[in-house]
Amino acid sequence: FEIALPRESNITVLIKLGTPTLLAKPCYIVISKRHITMLSIKSGERIVFTFSCQSPENHFVIEIQKNIDCMSGPCPFGEVQLQPSTSLLPTLNRTFIWDVKAHKSIGLELQFSIPRLRQIGPGESCPDGVTHSISGRIDATVVRIGTFCSNGTVSRIKMQEGVKMALHLPWFHPRNVSGFSIANRSSIKRLCIIESVFEGEGSATLMSANYPEGFPEDELMTWQFVVPAHLRASVSFLNFNLSNCERKEERVEYYIPGSTTNPEVFKLEDKQPGNMAGNFNLSLQGCDQDAQSPGILRLQFQVLVQHPQNESNKIYVVDLSNERAMSLTIEPRPVKQSRKFVPGCFVCLESRTCSSNLTLTSGSKHKISFLCDDLTRLWMNVEKTISCTDHRYCQRKSYSLQVPSDILHLPVELHDFSWKLLVPKDRLSLVLVPAQKLQQHTHEKPCNTSFSYLVASAIPSQDLYFGSFCPGGSIKQIQVKQNISVTLRTFAPSFQQEASRQGLTVSFIPYFKEEGVFTVTPDTKSKVYLRTPNWDRGLPSLTSVSWNISVPRDQVACLTFFKERSGVVCQTGRAFMIIQEQRTRAEEIFSLDEDVLPKPSFHHHSFWVNISNCSPTSGKQLDLLFSVTLTPRTVDLT
């Protein structure tokens, strides 16, 4: 064999004995009739030698070390070559070592082409015998970053102040390329950054520097994980030790792009996060150790990347192909921000595009799945517009306001389903007829059902909220003058079971001038509470609303107002209330801005209550709450 190393190549070749084995006969390197077991060849030297045995690979190993000095001149960045070429070397187990020395302010990045690297722990070996040993430097101290095999997830390792990379190839391995390149980066301000890329499902076991020995004192090491958004990552600590800290605390920090609480700080003994969708970083931060009894900080952990499990592994079909002007949004329900880590909760379209919010639009069939450990963290909001542009076509036309079954079958709670009902101005009005009579939600008689209908004006300039209504009351229908939004809002998961109670029909009817008319048919022995729209904010100025209250033939209705005065102060115009018997047309008119509200009154026949507002002064709004109670006529009311 002949090995000739060019001058200035900064390469040293060392042939030495390998791992001791029980061999009958030793083997020597023979050079100029001398028999030796170690041969060192330096830059500029040319040496001819042979071996004294037939199978030197059973005895000797060869180390080829190239020193790369980035301190005194430019650094040779780019793809790293195997020099001398493996074809010129004796067929021994060989280790190529690249020792790069750089300034503290220079970041060095090792980039590994496919296959990427897989870290192995103490006592483990690589199936093909090819190992990569990587170490860094802190001042004069060498720090072992780790030993790696092929076929893993580690794609890049960034260090500063220098790096030592040793590539070990068995004598029979045909590899003739280093498989990595070196690039310069700005200072990383930490010991190292290891990038781990997952293309699909898989796991990676990673270790702190110097593992199983102690992580360098008060150092910081970061792992960057690149994970497809449709997969989820979980971190579990396989083994860790804490050192004795004098100052600061040993911890791990998670950085999740897009999270509002970055970084998330954990103790090593905490349960580590699972079910993270997409990329994330994990950093290990050491502390100032007790000089007398430092102990050791070390960490071995596993990142498991997999498709979501169990319920969230299903694919749900949301068929909106027959719908028009409808959008469905799945989004996180608002929660109080806590400093505690919350794993990602994502919804995916076609199992590929995952995000925390997803909006599906009408006209298509959508396939969705979930990446979420707890689906109660999400909810659904749906908007559908029903509009009439031609009053001649729409009049008397009815639409059912019902949540489609496809939506009810999703494993995510429905929060709001809003119907925007639009009519041509001054041409048509709307009437809402529920499948079950409605109760108006009041403080005195709150709704306790799993859902309510929130009815409000849908005219941008108008701030008018008619109220919240739930099944099980006395309101038979609600007529409204112009555009409104009706929102079915759920309050409990039991809505799924109570969904059959929902059902509202909207019809387009001839235009009328009043803002709203409530038709009330009270049930015997139940007290019906009614209140003016925009409760707490006051009835909008110059707005008129009416209640058409039915009284059965054998009953008497008691109308009671819950305060002595309305409290309204008019800036312009008058606020008044008219109570009119429907049969006789007899009416009482009350000036709400002047008069005392009427005492409880008894009505033997159906009657109207109409309330019209003035333009009130601010802070003196019109809010009225009243009740209607039926009692049999036979009772002596004196």
Partner: antibody
């Protein structure tokens, strides 16, 4: 099992001679470099001489050159150290050792005392 | 002749401590350095050869490293059986072969 057993040590007067033997078993000494290393009482290790019998290579420390001779009998699988003109400073435990990975096998040592 | 300067000449340590012994060669010896452990009345035992290779049967808490002409023996976590004297030695074929003067590791 590889074993090295030294013999031939003892008390000798200055200027006298001794022949130390190192009987090897478990390997063939003709394939290996065989060495003698000594250790004076309470002191460190000092290399004395080596032989590679297949090629007749021998080598000596300056302190014993011309006085000591290393040899081997491959048929007996034994190495020898012939020590002449002994001095008080030659007093030590003499170890025979095989070298391959390093001084990987050592004998138990034999004490040589040079005193009048 | 190549001199091997070993330091310290003695040290006191406790069980579990990390112990480092260094040897400096007066000139380049490549990686032809070995480390030995010797207990009183016994022959030395080979621990490390070729500067950093662990000899068979030697516990993995022992390790060797080289930086130019400086060689280091490290015991990562000292055990009761490790209290002994340690020697470095240069070369196997470049004569004369020289040993360091030894480092005695004693119980603190």
């Amino acid at each position: 099992e590889v074993q090295l057993v030294e013999s031939g040590g003892g008390l000798v007067q200055p200027g006298g001679s001794l022949r130390l033997s190192c009987a090897a078993s478990g390997f063939n000494i003709s394939y290996y470099y065989m060495h003698w290393v000594r250790q004076a009482p309470g002191k460190g290790l000092e290399w004395v001489a080596s032989i590679y019998s297949s090629y007749g290579y021998t080598s000596y420390a300056d302190s014993v050159k011309g006085r000591f001779t290393i040899s081997a009998d491959t048929s007996k699988n034994t190495a020898y150290l012939q020590m002449n003109s002994l001095r008080a400073e030659d007093t030590a435990v003499y170890y025979c050792a095989r070298v391959y990975y390093g001084f990987d096998y050592w004998g138990q040592g034999t004490l040589v005392t040079v005193s009048s | 002749d190549i001199q091997m300067t070993q330091s310290p000449s003695s040290l006191s340590a406790s069980v579990g401590d990390r112990v480092t012994i260094t040897c400096r060669a007066s000139q380049s010896v490549s990686s032809a350095v070995a480390w030995y452990q010797q207990k009183p009345g016994k022959a030395p035992k080979l621990l490390i050869y070729s500067a950093s290779s662990l000899y068979s049967g030697v516990p993995s808490r022992f390790s060797g490293s080289r930086s130019g002409t400086d060689f280091t023996l490290t015991i990562s976590s000292l055990q009761p059986e490790d209290f002994a004297t340690y020697y470095c030695q240069q070369s196997y074929y470049v004569y004369p072969i020289t040993f360091g003067q030894g480092t005695k590791v004693e119980i603190k």
